[in-house]
């Protein structure tokens, strides 16, 4: 999906009003020195591409983020503010339902959510180049 035509300000508002707080709740009890961000993004569409990938694509050691509250709210925001996004996700959602597993918060998941927080920070304040 190409995130170029999303309403970035509306997504930012959704993130700041609820998603950010859910991410903080998920990370509670984790030391702020624990994880170094290794995933970066250069502009808002790129940030959303990376955010979608980390939030919804299962990875080795962390298969369950898509069922977390922040993930559901992220999906809702993208569905509302990115034209045509929901349609592209129908097949992906059906596939996810088939492999649904028990929620487990692993260290790998915590690291992944730390990466997500960093990606959202760059989404909220895109490009260290002149805007």
């Amino acid at each position: 999906y190409d995130f170029t035509n999303c309403d970035f300000e509306k997504i930012k508002a959704a993130y700041l009003s609820t998603i950010s707080k859910d991410l903080i709740t998920y990370m509670s009890g984790t030391k702020s020195t624990e994880f170094n961000n290794t995933v970066s993004c250069s502009n808002r569409p790129h940030c959303l591409t990376e955010i979608q990938s980390l939030t919804f694509n299962p990875t080795a050691g962390c298969a369950s983020l898509a069922k977390e509250m922040f993930a559901m709210k992220t999906k809702a925001a993208l569905a509302i503010w990115c034209p045509g996004y929901s349609e592209t996700q129908i097949n992906a959602t059906q596939a996810m339902k088939k492999r649904r597993k028990r929620k487990v918060t692993t260290n790998k998941c915590l690291e992944q959510v730390s990466q997500l927080q960093g990606l959202w920070r760059r989404f909220n304040r895109p490009l260290l180049k002149q805007q």
Partner: antibody
Framework: EVQLVQSGAEVKKPGSSVKVSCKAS????????IEWVRQAPGQGLEWIGV????????NYNENFKGRATLTADKSTSTAYMELSSLRSEDTAVYYC????????????WGQGTTVTVSS | DIVMTQSPDSLAVSLGERATINCKAS??????VTWYQQKPGQSPKLLIY???NHYTGVPDRFSGSGSGTDFTFTISSLQAEDVAVYYC?????????FGQGTKLEIK
Amino acid sequence: EVQLVQSGAEVKKPGSSVKVSCKASGYAFSNYLIEWVRQAPGQGLEWIGVIDPGNGDTNYNENFKGRATLTADKSTSTAYMELSSLRSEDTAVYYCAREDNTGTAFDYWGQGTTVTVSS
Amino acid sequence: DIVMTQSPDSLAVSLGERATINCKASQSVSSDVTWYQQKPGQSPKLLIYYVSNHYTGVPDRFSGSGSGTDFTFTISSLQAEDVAVYYCQQHHRFPLTFGQGTKLEIK
């Protein structure tokens, strides 16, 4: 506990340079932008620029372009602001600050470094 | 550059009364406005981000509102420890810019 500790006061001659350091602790240094802001005596706040310690990307206020240089050393979790061609109007308190967890504000500030430019 | 203009420059309010500071941007900054408090000899402190969100530990008597170009910062019931200079800042476009500050005193 997040802390930003800045280097001590400096007195400089016009035309010289100054390098202010900002040592971060209590968080993953490369994950958060470091901002630099200055405040002339009795005046308001002026943004100098920002650096991403993770990759070295910078953005400068045009008013300081060519005179200010922002760098970061990940091995010591220290950010630096160097200002060259100093003039008396550069006399100010210089602050480093960290972006907050959402990327929309500065949540932790250094104690400030007073730079006095005088002949 | 986006110019942030605060009004008034100084304000005297009685203890327990409401204090209101306005901040006007020279062009739309969406909701990307932050408010800081600075006491004499201290570094600025973050109070409100993204117009109306309280930073951790900031008392409820502080609040912010507005969007676009017009923003308001309010202290609902002034306490002695609120005497300070207050700054608005826009985070919408580089270079980031601050208002000139509003000095709040007790009447």
